[in-house]
């Protein structure tokens, strides 16, 4: 039995997988900030988690996925005030009783130190200093991400 938020997350991920392959992204679009091999878009408005998820999808992106503590710290350094919370692509899976990224992988417990409860209808937000479990219906800002395509050096034959 999947919660409505889990269904929404799966549906959006599946619809993205069905779309035709697009050429790789070499540069970040206007208004997006580059952080290493990603482009990030920090919303200015607020939304519940599932609306934020959908908004990123309409931008051909996803809610932020954080690989490790180092990436978390670099992302937090881009947040300008301590009283701003941003949704990322991590929520509590009731069926699996674990934190689950929207790409289907589970949270490595060492990656993020989450403050708050792991329970139904809990989604993860980040601030300048911390990672919080908040109710998914809370309206806060969110971060979308696009992956940059690594540029490989092409070897051309002599002409």
């Amino acid at each position: 039995q999947k919660s409505s938020i889990e269904k929404c997350s799966v549906d959006i991920q599946q619809s993205r997988n069905k779309t035709t392959e697009r050429p790789g992204l070499l540069n970040c679009p206007i208004y997006w900030q580059q952080l290493r091999e990603k482009c990030l878009l920090f919303s200015h408005t607020v939304n519940p988690w599932n609306n934020s998820l959908a908004d990123c999808s309409t931008k051909e992106s996803s809610l932020l996925l954080i690989r490790d503590k180092d990436e978390l710290i670099h992302t937090q350094n881009l947040i300008r005030d301590k009283a701003i919370l941003f949704w990322i692509g991590l929520n509590f899976s009731l069926s699996e009783k674990n934190w689950k990224w929207i790409n289907g992988s589970f949270l490595n417990s060492n990656d993020l130190e989450i403050r708050g409860d792991a329970k139904e209808n809990s989604c993860i937000s980040i601030s300048q200093t911390s990672v919080y479990s908040e109710y998914c219906s809370t309206e806060i800002r969110w971060i979308c991400q696009k992956e940059l395509t690594p540029v490989r050096n092409k070897v051309y034959p002599d002409s």
Epitope: H44, V46, R115, E134, Y135, E139, R141
Partner: antibody, heavy 119, light 107 residues
Framework: EVQLVESGGGLVQPGGSLRLSCAAS????????MSWVRQAPGKGLEWVST????????YYADSVKGRFTISRDNSRNTLYLQMNSLRAEDTAVYYC????????????WGQGTLVTVSS | GIQMTQSPSSLSASVGDRVTITCRAS??????LNWYQQKPGKAPKLLIY???SLQSGVPSRFSGSGSGTDFTLTISSLQPEDFATYYC?????????FGQGTKVEIK
């Protein structure tokens, strides 16, 4: 209908303590950040403190940091402000308000409760 | 913190007048500005959020404009119930700060 009702104000001596409460109804309390804003007699509005919906994150004005503690009980739909080491300059009407995380404003306010710090 | 300065601090006007109140931030706050109305002995009421968005239930005679550091609240045709004190507030960064207020009195 959204309602916020403060209680717990009163007369207290300098150095004393007081706990304010704010009973909320008419909305999903746990989904909203909540704040305290105060207004000294005849003066303007001053933000005091904000707490996120889960209670995990809290923020304070420098003037109250280390003396006041904001908290909430989502099972009781109640917001609290524990005020210690009270000073004369803390005398004000204290309002409970919904909102306070950037960029949201305070869209609903309680009627206020008066705190008087005097010997 | 960011300082918010309102002008004038008070004004006298008649019913039907167009009233303009300005608010200036000590640094750019984009459009993170709200306007509140407060009547004596009552709690403040949110009128305008995000500089120009009208809060639900607020009469359309109230409007807000501006971005960056300079903002304006306009009452297109002052009504008897509009005599009150008006405050601007920035939500760009903590501490969240208010202007000192503008008292609108009956001429």
């Amino acid at each position: 209908e959204v309602q916020l009702v403060e209680s717990g104000g009163g007369l207290v001596q300098p150095g004393g303590s007081l706990r304010l409460s704010c009973a909320a109804s008419g909305f999903t309390f746990s989904s909203y950040a909540m704040s305290w804003v105060r207004q000294a007699p005849g003066k303007g509005l001053e933000w005091v403190s904000t707490i996120s919906g889960s209670g995990g994150s809290t923020y304070y004005a420098d003037s109250v940091k280390g003396r006041f503690t904001i908290s909430r009980d989502n099972s009781r739909n109640t917001l609290y402000l524990q005020m210690n080491s009270l000073r004369a300059e803390d005398t004000a009407v204290y309002y409970c308000a919904r909102g306070g995380l950037i960029p949201s404003g305070f869209d609903y306010w309680g009627q206020g409760t008066l705190v008087t710090v005097s010997s | 913190g960011i300082q918010m300065t309102q002008s004038p601090s008070s004004l006298s006007a008649s019913v039907g007048d167009r009233v303009t109140i300005t608010c200036r931030a000590s640094q750019s706050i984009s459009s993170y500005l709200n306007w509140y109305q407060q009547k004596p002995g009552k709690a403040p009421k949110l009128l305008i959020y995000a500089a120009s968005s009208l809060q639900s239930g607020v009469p359309s005679r109230f409007s807000g404009s501006g971005s960056g550091t300079d903002f304006t609240l306009t009452i297109s045709s002052l009504q008897p119930e509009d005599f009150a004190t008006y405050y601007c507030q920035q939500t760009y960064s903590t501490p969240l700060t208010f202007g000192q207020g503008t008292k609108v009195e009956i001429k």
